[in-house]
Amino acid sequence: AESCTSRPHITVVEGEPFYLKHCSCSLAHEIETTTKSWYKSSGSQEHVELNPRSSSRIALHDCVLEFWPVELNDTGSYFFQMKNYTQKWKLNVIRRNKHSCFTERQVTSKIVEVKKFFQITCENSYYQTLVNSTSLYKNCKKLLLENNKNPTIKKNAEFEDQGYYSCVHFLHHNGKLFNITKTFNITIVEDRSNIVPVLLGPKLNHVAVELGKNVRLNCSALLNEEDVIYWMFGEENGSDPNIHEEKEMRIMTPEGKWHASKVLRIENIGESNLNVLYNCTVASTGGTDTKSFILVRKADMADIPGHVFTR
């Protein structure tokens, strides 16, 4: 059985069949006599009860609200109500891209490693019994595959496999032909094994400061998920109440690695903060990398060549 629609925010493409299935379905069967209602609210109107009479495109079956098909004006909030159970969804219907076989905003991205197993299977369990045929397209060019009920690609991944794969299911309902499109953006990468982590920027940084002011030293690295980045300063970390390590920020790169940055904030800079090493280290099983920062009083800048300064 098709699982219920648990996502509260849903984006769909106009002109395709679509359904909402509430998540107390098994419960609803047990209490057949209980009143079950579907409502819609949009900007202009509040809580309008839905039934097949409200639109020829809407069908109600047990736990499901079906659209044949969904259209732009179906955008809004939908509610299912049964006794003291309520479920709400926010539906956003977007315009179909008429110049392509798929709509860019409705694409699922996948990263596959080269020479590893690459699989795409075209399935749609909810509409399975109504599907006449299914076609698989790569970059909107139809692939001639053996099985036209559930076309499948299973192969060793190659760089040339990169692209947009669209499963298009063709189905009939009440004498009309509909299609449902599911598109995958497949990116082929070399591999996602561990890299040797590296700190970005020069290994030694002189930072010009003024006494009594604050400074933020930013340490950035390219690293693996399990690697750590940390600051070392003074004889005992944490002995200076004016020095604070900020929360580490991480962003995933397209290759599946991480770009991390950790800021060391020095407040109310004093003489004791000048001309000492503030070391940032990235550590992993593959080794470590360290870069150093030295705070220099602005007045002393003339003694240091220009190329060693960082902002």
Epitope: L143, I153, K155, R192, I195
Partner: antibody, heavy 118, light 112 residues
């Protein structure tokens, strides 16, 4: 010219491990994946897995998962295949083979005979 | 895994005669997106490693004599030696590289 030179024959006891090396020359070692294939006496060829010498990334055949480890040392252009918990049916000639980029193998090492016997 | 089955297991052919080896895969190794068959043929002489003869089912590796040719598509493939020479005595293997990598059991070619 491209050459893959493997380490010499080994005799091992059941339960032990063996590490076979494959030294590459005549091409950029990190530019091509390296596969390992074995051949039991009088038998056919069996794919074991590959290593990407550039990153150290690996992909092992399901049959060998947990027993095989493929590594490399880029400084000496050498790939290694270590097989642990050896059994008598691991007696075979082990080959390294270069993947020329299109999934098929264009150059092979001369082979290393590994005999597992008590 | 894709199972590769070669026939015959052994073959005796007179010098100068044609030798034909068949290879059948348990599922298609043809990919319509690039019109390629993911199949290679190897030659292995006693005490030597396999040597690549043919890839993409019909492309001859450089340096391989033109008496060797590959044909077929989908699940059925053939390696043909148009005029057998003494140095062609060997075991020949087909290999698919479409889903992981698997080899046929080999065909031994001898002189009659």
């Amino acid at each position: 010219q491209v050459q893959l030179v493997q380490s010499g024959a080994e005799v091992k006891k059941p339960g032990a491990s063996v590490k076979v090396s494959c030294k590459a020359s005549g091409y950029t070692f990190t530019g091509y994946y390296m596969h390992w294939v074995r051949q039991a006496p009088g038998q056919g060829l069996e794919w074991m897995g590959w290593i990407n010498p550039n990153s150290g990334g690996t992909n092992y055949a399901q049959k060998f998962q947990g027993r095989v480890t493929m590594t490399r040392d880029t400084s000496i252009s050498t790939a290694y295949m270590e097989l642990s918990r050896l059994r008598s049916d691991d007696t075979a000639v082990y080959y390294c083979a270069r993947d020329m980029g299109d999934l098929f193998f264009d150059y092979w090492g001369q082979g290393t005979l590994v005999t597992v016997s008590s | 895994d894709i199972v590769m089955t070669q026939s015959p297991d052994s073959l005796a052919v007179s010098l100068g005669e044609r030798a034909t080896i068949n290879c059948k895969s348990s599922q298609s190794v043809f990919y319509s997106s690039n019109n390629k068959n993911y199949l290679a043929w190897f030659q292995q002489k006693p005490g030597q490693p396999p040597k690549l003869l043919i890839y993409w089912a019909s492309t001859r590796e450089s340096g391989v004599p033109d008496r060797f040719s590959g044909s077929g598509s989908g699940t059925d493939f053939t390696l043909t030696i148009s005029s057998l020479q003494a140095e062609d005595v060997a075991v020949y293997y087909c290999q698919q590289y479409f889903i992981t990598w698997t080899f046929g059991q080999g065909t031994k070619v001898e002189i009659k």
